[in-house]
């Protein structure tokens, strides 16, 4: 039997309730050795990939996906998946981003922290090469 890959986790900084125009960063975490992290929105067809992976701890790697100015259209469900050669992981649970009318400045503290970890779907079917991740955007809309 193949060795299981641990599920990724997803969190949002500074939280999951973000004022319009403020920034948010999604943080995807997985084991060491991850080559590519993918942040998916709602379904597999809308995603962003990054190979800018850093080591968060001796046993964990992470990638960060930043939206500089959140719009209403950024609200929705997000999840992470990673590629650790030669396999894609299962996906994290969904994290819901809520966008609200700005009541203060961009650094207004009225956000709620949020994180999630668990299952879901798959990467886009961009590559049938089991030893390479699907190339970004070939069949996908970009998140932002």
């Amino acid at each position: 039997q193949e060795e299981d890959l641990p599920r990724p986790s997803i969190s949002a900084e500074p939280g999951t309730v973000i004022p319009l125009g403020s920034h948010v960063t999604f943080v995807c975490r997985g084991p060491v050795g991850v080559q590519t992290f993918r942040l998916e929105r709602d379904s597999r067809s809308t995603y962003n990939d990054t190979e800018d992976v850093s080591q968060a701890s001796p046993s964990e790697s992470e990638a960060r996906f930043r939206i500089d100015s959140v719009r209403e259209g950024n609200a929705g469900l997000y999840r992470c998946i990673y590629y650790k050669p030669p396999k894609w992981s299962e996906q994290s649970d969904y994290l819901e981003l809520l966008v609200k009318e700005s009541s203060g400045g961009p650094d207004s503290p009225d956000t709620e922290p949020g994180s999630s970890a668990g299952p879901t779907q798959r990467p886009s079917d961009n590559s049938h090469n089991e030893h390479a991740p699907a190339s970004q955007g070939l069949k996908a809309e970009h998140l932002y």
Epitope: D4, G118, R122, P123
Partner: antibody, heavy 121, light 111 residues
């Protein structure tokens, strides 16, 4: 066109073992699908047996199926269901199903036609 | 262990009527709920995923909704072709709990 085809259904005696195969075409296991086995006894409802994630290798079983049923990925296009110590209660049509390519939350969107397993002496 | 309790076991309704089928999850399953239609001798067909999202090609007469751990499939403006057995399924496979369980099914007869 994407499809699934089960094979290996047979008439076997109580206590015997049997292995069913599910062959996929039109898509790649490397893209990470949940490949599931579901059974349906004659005139009864659907019963989930378990699933394997085709890329990561993670396997999930119904509690009643653990120990007697084993799901494996045997190639880039085939998953199998090994069944042991079979009894008359295991008589059913066995379906292979795959979760969705375009929807979230893992619904079984693609189903095979099923293969009939009959346990009788 | 997750249990999906589906009610009623059977229902009979006239053409043009409305049928409501409920599925109660024994614990929170966070919208990981699908509804299927199955006709005798056929494989199941996906109708609803994520509790309330309609699968492609499925009539908008089928509607899914959620209230806490209770999930509902409503079929309006019934047609003869809707005669079938309907199943709910938890579609979460993970570490929190093992999903996959189906409800017992609801046989819909069209009068």
């Amino acid at each position: 066109e994407q499809s699934l085809e089960e094979s290996g259904g047979d008439l076997v005696k109580p206590g015997a073992s049997l292995t069913l195969a599910c062959t996929a075409s039109g898509f790649s296991f490397s893209d990470g699908y949940y490949m599931c086995w579901v059974r349906q006894a004659p005139g009864k409802g659907l019963e989930w047996i378990g699933c394997i994630h085709s890329s990561s290798g993670s396997i999930y079983y119904a509690s009643w199926a653990k120990g007697r049923f084993t799901i494996s990925k045997t190639s880039s296009t085939m998953v199998t269901l090994q069944m042991s110590s079979l009894t008359a209660a295991d008589t059913a049509t066995y379906f292979c199903a795959r979760d969705s390519e375009s929807y979230g939350y893992n619904p079984c969107e693609l189903w095979g036609p099923g293969t009939l397993v009959t346990i009788s002496s | 262990e997750l249990v999906m309790t589906q009610t009623p076991a059977s229902v009979s309704e006239a053409v043009g009527g409305t049928v409501t089928i409920k599925c109660q999850a024994s614990q929170t399953i966070s919208n990981y709920l699908a509804w299927y239609q199955q006709k005798p001798g056929q494989r199941p067909k996906l109708l609803i995923y994520a509790a309330s999202s309609l699968a492609s090609g499925v009539s908008s007469r089928f509607r899914g909704s959620r209230s806490g751990t209770e999930y509902t499939l409503t079929i309006t403006d019934l047609e003869c072709d809707d005669a079938a057995t309907y199943y709910c399924q938890c579609t979460y496979y993970g570490t929190t709990y093992i999903g996959g369980a189906f409800g017992g099914g609801t046989e819909v007869e069209i009068k």
